[in-house]
Interface confidence: low
């Protein structure tokens, strides 16, 4: 009796499973009672002998690429052989590498967690990816693992990482780049700093004092208000960042606390107090403020 | 200003599992992580495991991970730890910790667990 | 796991004198992307909590009194105390947070 080993199917791909199977076209199994073994090159395979004519190898790689064969043993002990089949198993090359970040839109706050994941729409077997900051491309890290995906994390962002970054996916057959994904690192405004000035040393009445208030770290657009004791004044832009200012034509009731409050929509920041007196100098006819 | 408060100590059998917790305020609980340290009497400090309070997602110092179980309540401002299976070599205080720039800037006061019988 | 070994583990200082600690770690703390070190040092003071002191290995957390200075880069760090103070006395604690945490087995310093 003649065996032959089929192995479907006969051209798998990496990752994918097959199934091996004794065959005996002239004598039905069932007639006799057979053990079956399978072997790749020189080494049994599976569970070694046993009564199934059938072996499910779950995932094939690239290394398993050899030549197979099987045999039966009957009760009484006389082995029959098939011939040696070559399986080739295929590798898929890498492709579609796209970069993403998490969070999405590549907006991210000063001081969370930044992940980079790298991804492949297709590809088996080890599949290295590389991570690569600014467009000349300082590499950050490389990663080699059997998946489509893979994450290199900034546990803690700072104002240095707002670059372009991309990832390469290789496997074997050159590398393939994703496209450059943009980092904004989105910074919360620090407590602004109102200063006073005005057009001489000791203002006075009818003069226009300038309130300009500034936090000096905080993501643009930034929207300053400003206050006297409790109420608004009135709000300025500053649009790239920077500080805004506030016209303010005195009057004896302009005395009091005035504050200033950053807000770039990521938090808002309140200034420090500063307190405005008129004075009456001895001998002066005018009313004068003090800061 | 940034609190995190726990209870001072828990007593318990061996055994038995237990739940610690961590309330946090004054501050957004959901932007930063909480990690929770061990410290046995008169050691050292052991990381058990990280959790994002956003995603719920968690990290595990590998010794720790059969023995420790990360959760966290949003509505609450909670962190939570589950240690099950006690035994004496559980007996320590467990900190919770705010992460921020990668470092851990505010701690609770710790929960005393004694495991006896 | 990134190992932290720091030394002495003990020191006894008179008040007013300088003291330096050790920390070493199994690898390079200094990330690539922001040319920082990540490596934190905690005070513990009796029956106290951990106090965050410096992270990003030189950067003093606020409040922190600037007696108090963190230096070294890669895998050798150091913390300084300019004038000690009878109120320093605590463990202090290295820790790297490059990958998953690890902290030193601490230095204790002692008044004498």
């Known amino acids: 009796a003649e065996l032959f080993l089929i192995a479907s199917p006969s051209h798998p791909t990496e990752g994918s499973p097959v199934t091996l199977t004794c065959k005996m076209p002239f004598l039905q199994s069932s007639d006799a009672q057979f053990q079956f073994c399978f072997f790749r090159d020189t080494r049994a395979l599976g569970p070694g002998w046993s009564s199934s004519p059938k072996l499910q190898i779950a995932a094939m790689w690239k290394e398993d690429t050899g030549s197979y064969w099987c045999e039966a043993q009957t009760m009484a002990s006389k082995v029959l052989r098939s011939r040696r089949s070559q399986i080739n198993v295929h590798r898929v090359p890498v492709a579609d590498v796209s970069l993403e970040t998490q969070p999405p839109g590549g907006q991210v706050m000063e001081g969370d967690r930044l992940v980079l994941i790298c991804s492949v729409a297709m590809g088996t077997g080890d599949i290295t990816f590389l991570w690569y900051k600014g467009a000349v491309g300082l590499n950050l890290q490389s990663k080699t693992q059997r998946s489509l995906t893979a994450e290199y994390e900034i546990p803690s962002v700072r104002e240095s990482d707002a670059e372009q970054y991309y990832c390469v996916a290789e496997n074997g057959y050159g590398p393939s780049p994703s496209g450059l994904v943009s980092i904004t690192v989105r910074i919360p405004v620090s407590r602004p700093i109102l200063m006073l000035r005005a057009p001489r040393a000791q203002a006075a009445v009818e003069d226009v004092l300038e309130l300009h208030c500034e936090a000096l770290r905080g993501s643009p657009p930034i929207l300053y208000w400003f206050y006297h004791e409790d109420i608004t004044l009135g709000s300025r832009s500053a649009p790239s960042g920077g500080g805004a200012s506030f016209n303010l034509s005195l009057t004896e009731e302009h005395s009091g606390n005035y504050s200033c409050e950053a807000n770039n929509g990521l938090g808002a920041q309140r200034s420090e107090a500063v307190t405005l007196n008129f004075t009456v100098p001895t001998g002066a006819r005018s009313n004068h403020l003090t800061s | 200003q940034v609190q995190l408060q726990q209870p001072g100590a828990e007593l318990v059998k061996p055994g038995t599992s237990v739940k610690l917790s961590c309330k946090a305020s004054?501050?957004?609980?959901?932007?930063?992580?909480m990690h929770w340290v061990k410290q046995r009497p008169g050691q050292g400090l052991e990381w058990i495991g990280r959790?994002?309070?956003?995603?719920?997602?968690?990290k595990y110092n590998e010794k720790f991970k059969s023995k420790a179980t990360l959760t966290v309540d949003k509505t609450s401002s909670s962190a939570y730890m589950q240690l099950n299976s006690l035994t004496s070599e559980d007996s320590a205080v467990y900190y919770c910790?705010?992460?921020?720039?990668?470092?851990?800037?505010?701690w609770g006061q710790g929960t005393s667990v004694t495991v006896s019988s | 796991d990134i190992v932290m070994s720091q030394s002495p583990s003990s020191l006894a200082v008179s008040v007013g004198e300088k003291v330096t600690m050790s920390c070493k770690s199994s690898q390079s703390l200094l990330y690539s992307s922001n040319q920082k070190n990540y490596l934190a040092w905690y005070q513990q003071k009796p029956g106290q909590s951990p106090k965050l002191l410096i992270y990003w290995a030189s950067t003093r957390e606020s409040g922190v009194p600037d007696r108090f200075t963190g230096s070294g880069s890669g895998t050798d760090f150091t913390l300084t105390i300019s004038s000690v103070k009878a109120e320093d006395l605590a463990i202090y604690y290295c820790?790297?947070?490059?990958?998953?945490?690890?902290f030193g087995s601490g230095t204790k310093l002692e008044i004498k």
């Open positions: 820790q790297q947070y490059s990958n998953y945490p690890t």
């Open positions: 004054g501050y957004t609980f959901t932007r930063y992580w």
């Open positions: 910790t705010r992460v921020n720039s990668g470092a851990m800037d505010y």
């Open positions: 959790i994002d309070p956003n995603s719920g997602g968690s």
